[in-house]
């Protein structure tokens, strides 16, 4: 807290300029008018203030705007943003994407800080949903942003936003998140034809149910093994050998290298060995000839 002292004669700031870097903390407090600072915030960023001096400037703004800064000030905070606490940011009402971009730029190259997380949360809540332009911006700064959201938060993502998602944005998503995003992607891309559709939907297939995988198997899509290995095990298990063969096309040979890993391992255990042998890959572990296959889930339902 800076003590209240009178401004020395001739030192009253008429504008925010470089001469202020020579002011001591108490002089900044006494000689810089908060209203002047607010109207000339855009100049602060160009002046090499020390962290201590920035603390004083923040204090002046806090006094002027105890209920939270207006967006005209927030947009020009620049490095002063790094001085803000999540509690400060919760008082803000940020509606402009330009303001969001300006503040994210300040934090660029760093991991998402609590301040940035709070800012994004305030912005998205203010907009009501995570629209395409916002998602575009956020994933550009933080590729893992989408996967940091809960399934409940993801449910408010409109399908049009999915167009902004790049494959790498989904790298850290878990199956629960993909369960929510996949139906959105299906809706978003539904006007595309077969081959284009598959290219777009491929990254989201970790959330696809069995029905959709069966339908895809009829489309000559030639899914690569990397994508197949990311599919939900429970969605893969009911697929027949013929369906997996159609789904993978020429990539079916890659099953051999993955036979000990999920979901391939579990899928093999569910297939008849006879059927697996038709692939000619030497896959072992299927149900031997003559064995009866009981559907235990059906048995449970009956008991």
């Amino acid at each position: 807290e800076v003590e209240k002292t009178a401004c020395p004669s001739g030192k009253k700031a008429r504008e925010i300029d470089e001469s202020l870097i020579f002011y001591k903390k108490w002089e900044l407090e006494a000689c810089v008018d908060a209203a002047l600072l607010a109207t000339q915030m855009d100049r602060v960023n160009a002046i090499p203030f020390t962290y201590e001096q920035l603390d004083v400037l923040k204090h002046k703004l806090d006094e002027l705007y105890p209920q939270g800064y207006p967006e005209s000030v927030i947009q020009h905070l620049g490095y002063l943003f790094l001085k803000m606490s999540p509690e400060d940011i919760r008082k803000w009402n940020v509606t402009s994407l330009e303001t969001l971009k300006a503040l994210l730029e300040v934090n660029k190259g760093h991991e998402m800080s609590p301040q940035v997380a709070t800012l994004i949360d305030r912005f998205v809540k203010g907009r009501g949903q995570l629209d395409k332009d916002t998602l575009d911006t956020l994933t550009a700064f933080y590729p893992g942003y989408l996967c940091s959201l809960s399934p409940e938060e993801l449910s408010s993502v409109p399908p049009s936003s999915i167009w902004a998602v790049r494959p790498q944005d989904l790298d850290t998503c878990d199956p629960r998140q993909l369960d929510v995003l996949y139906p959105k992607a299906r809706l978003a891309f539904q006007n595309m034809n077969g081959s284009e559709y598959f290219v777009k939907i491929q990254s989201f297939l970790g959330g696809a149910p069995t029905e959709d995988l069966k339908a895809l198997s009829q489309q000559n899509v030639s899914m690569d093994l990397a994508t197949f290995m990311k599919l939900r095990t429970d969605a893969v298990l009911p697929l027949t050998v013929a369906e997996v063969q159609k789904l993978l096309g020429p990539h079916v040979e890659g099953l051999k290298a993955e036979e000990r890993h999920r979901p391939v391992r579990d899928w093999i255990l569910r297939q008849r060995q006879d059927d697996l042998d038709t692939l000619g890959l030497g896959l072992q572990g299927g149900i031997p000839n003559g064995y009866l296959v009981l559907d235990l889930s059906m048995q449970e339902a009956l008991s």
């Epitope: 139906p183 539904q190 595309m192 077969g194 029905e211």
Partner: antibody, heavy 122, light 106 residues
């Protein structure tokens, strides 16, 4: 033959909420998307939203955002549509419809419920 | 918001061909579906993805879509085809239904 059976007609006061249910006969209901469409008296069809097979993902028409909630009880093969802050303009027949076709990017509404008339009147 | 416009009514004699149009900006870039609705009944899907027929729908129903217009054609129209018909397409974040066309079989 698969059927979607909806709950009965409702009369509600403005500002209230209504919850319409849609139950499927048959064991495969939980494998399909369910959509909701409404039709005001003498008017055309209006899409409200969609819920995925597991019930974890919903997409609502912008017009109903914040007022509509679609949920799914997979144990009873029932989907629910709740509309809040009702006004007289919400008086309509509300339909649930299921996407059963197997097209890989297909969302046609193949099987429809019989409709539920919701009347909003003071 | 996206709009799909249909003629309010179309009249056709039994055995003749009825064509119902549905106009929307760049509609040809989207897949169009068509629903039939008879008085007091729930709608029935008759065409999806521009020109595909669900099982159980008679061959006399066909569809096309290009430019700004999708068309539902009923060849050899029968009295039982008298109904309201709605086109539908996905735009941005919602399904949009057309204004509806009442087909009367004279």
């Amino acid at each position: 033959e698969v059927q979607l059976v909806q709950s009965g007609a409702e009369v509600k006061k403005p500002g209230a909420s209504v919850k319409v249910s849609c139950k499927a006969s048959g064991d495969t209901f939980n494998r399909y998307y369910v959509q909701w469409v409404r039709q005001a008296p003498g008017q055309g069809l209006e899409w409200m939203g969609i819920i995925n097979p597991s019930g974890v993902s919903t997409t609502y028409a912008q017009k109903f955002q914040g007022r509509v909630t679609m949920t799914r009880d997979t144990s009873t093969s029932t989907v629910y549509m709740e509309l809040s802050s009702l006004r007289s303009e919400d008086t309509a027949v509300y339909y649930c419809a299921e996407t059963r076709g197997s097209g890989f990017n297909y969302f046609g509404m193949d099987v429809w419920g019989q409709g539920t008339l919701v009347t909003v009147s003071s | 918001s996206y709009e799909l416009t249909q003629p309010p009514s179309v009249s056709v004699s039994p055995g003749q061909t009825a064509s119902i149009t549905c106009s929307g900006d760049k509609l040809g870039d989207k897949y169009a579906s068509w629903y039939q609705q008879k008085p007091g009944q729930s709608p029935v899907l008759v065409i999806y993805q521009d020109n595909r027929r669900p099982s159980g729908i008679p061959e006399r129903f066909s569809g096309s879509n290009s430019g700004n217009t999708a068309t539902l054609t009923i060849s050899g129209t029968q009295a039982m085809d008298e109904a309201d018909y709605y086109c539908q397409a996905w735009d941005s974040d919602t399904y949009v239904f057309g204004t509806g066309t009442k087909v009367t079989v004279l």
